[in-house]
């Protein structure tokens, strides 16, 4: 708290300008009118105020707007946004994408802070869904944003928004998130031709079921090993050696280097050794010739 002291003669601020730069904390408190500050917030960002000075300016705005700042002030907060707490932000009603962009720009270079997370949450809830423009904006500032959402939150992403997603935006997504995003991506890209479709869908394939992988194997897609290694193990296991060979194309040789890692390891254990031998890669661990494979899960379903 800053003590209430009278403003020294001749120091009363008539506008927010560079003359305030060396005002001490108590001088800013005494000599700057909160209403003037609110109407000239855009000028604050042109002046290299210290953190200590920004604290005083925030305190003045808090006194003027105890129920939360109006959007006209929020849009021009600039570096003052860094001084806001999640509790402050929960009082706001941010509806303009321009306001969101302005505040994210201030936070550029910082990790996603609790303040930013709260701001985004308030904004998205206010909009009702994560529309394409919002998603575009958020992933531009925070490539990992999508993967920070729960599967439930991701379910509100309309398929049209998927066009804004770049491969790097999905780098940290786990299988549960990709399970939600993949069907949306499939729907979004459904009218594209084979090779273009594969380029777009590739980053989402960690959520693809077996039947879609089988379909892709018929299209000469030449999936790279990095993508293959991110596929769901349960989706890969039912694929035949021939289907994996077609799916990977020339990249099939990379299986040897990954034979001890999932899903390759688990897939090898499900294949007949003589089928694996047809690849000529020296993959070992398949089912020996002459052994009968019983699918117990199928047997249980029948009984």
């Amino acid at each position: 708290e800053v003590e209430k002291t009278a403003c020294p003669s001749g120091k009363k601020a008539r506008e927010i300008d560079e003359s305030l730069i060396f005002y001490k904390k108590w001088e800013l408190e005494a000599c700057v009118d909160a209403a003037l500050l609110a109407t000239q917030m855009d000028r604050v960002n042109a002046i290299p105020f210290t953190y200590e000075q920004l604290d005083v300016l925030k305190h003045k705005l808090d006194e003027l707007y105890p129920q939360g700042y109006p959007e006209s002030v929020i849009q021009h907060l600039g570096y003052l946004f860094l001084k806001m707490s999640p509790e402050d932000i929960r009082k706001w009603n941010v509806t303009s994408l321009e306001t969101l962009k302005a505040l994210l720009e201030v936070n550029k270079g910082h990790e996603m802070s609790p303040q930013v997370a709260t701001l985004i949450d308030r904004f998205v809830k206010g909009r009702g869904q994560l529309d394409k423009d919002t998603l575009d904006t958020l992933t531009a500032f925070y490539p990992g944003y999508l993967c920070s959402l729960s599967p439930e939150e991701l379910s509100s992403v309309p398929p049209s928004s998927i066009w804004a997603v770049r491969p790097q935006d999905l780098d940290t997504c786990d299988p549960r998130q990709l399970d939600v995003l993949y069907p949306k991506a499939r729907l979004a890209f459904q009218n594209m031709n084979g090779s273009e479709y594969f380029v777009k869908i590739q980053s989402f394939l960690g959520g693809a079921p077996t039947e879609d992988l089988k379909a892709l194997s018929q299209q000469n897609v030449s999936m790279d090993l990095a993508t293959f290694m991110k596929l769901r193990t349960d989706a890969v296991l039912p694929l035949t050696v021939a289907e994996v060979q077609k799916l990977l194309g020339p990249h099939v040789e990379g299986l040897k280097a990954e034979e001890r890692h999932r899903p390759v390891r688990d897939w090898i254990l499900r294949q007949r050794q003589d089928d694996l031998d047809t690849l000529g890669l020296g993959l070992q661990g398949g089912i020996p010739n002459g052994y009968l494979v019983l699918d117990l899960s199928m047997q249980e379903a029948l009984s």
């Epitope: 560079e18 003359s19 730069i21 002046i47 290299p48 210290t50 953190y51 570096y79």
Partner: antibody, heavy 119, light 106 residues
Framework: QVQLVESGGGLVKPGGSLRLSCAAS????????MSWIRQAPGKGLEWVSY????????YYADSVKGRFTISRDNAKNSLYLQMNSLRAEDTAVYYC????????????WGQGTLVTVSS | IQLTQSPSSLSASVGDRVTITCRAS??????LAWYQQKPGKAPKLLIY???SLESGVPSRFSGSGSGTDFTLTISSLQPEDFATYYC?????????FGGGTKVEIK
Amino acid sequence: QVQLVESGGGLVKPGGSLRLSCAASGFTFSDYYMSWIRQAPGKGLEWVSYISSSGSTIYYADSVKGRFTISRDNAKNSLYLQMNSLRAEDTAVYYCAVHLKRRPYFDYWGQGTLVTVSS
Amino acid sequence: IQLTQSPSSLSASVGDRVTITCRASQGISSALAWYQQKPGKAPKLLIYDASSLESGVPSRFSGSGSGTDFTLTISSLQPEDFATYYCQQFNSYPLTFGGGTKVEIK
């Protein structure tokens, strides 16, 4: 890209004067606060002086107050430091720096100019 | 506000994880910047607001801390990282620097 080029350094006797210049390019000079920072040989950094974008607000470190004058010519994209009554302890490399993010730290620095005060 | 850096110098090898600390004489929130200076060159801004990486600075550099204690970490030292590192506070005027930490080749 942003460029700051200092000049005017040299050898001067105690009590003498020098005027340093800093030519700026690659950004709108008149929009930004500028600073002079110095570094004595083998020593750390000391913030010497600060000038606002219009030139109306100025700061000096106590060690140079009354002897140094900072100024700028926005039409010429130039920053200046007039140094009078120089002392041996003013010997240092002098850097100009710009506050491009409009924050109180130094985003870009010039390469520096050496001022040596010695009899 | 005084800033005290430690150690004043250290020897390390390429690939090492290096940590430099900066202590403020009073609380400065997260108003701290870190600079790198190579011999005969101007300082270069690495980190601001205690932990924000300046554009173009490699991600092996990271900053942390708030209040009075701050840390600059280089996760895997590279040949070009041998230099002197300075902290600077901007919580209040006058702006002040730490005394520097020289990182030398072991």
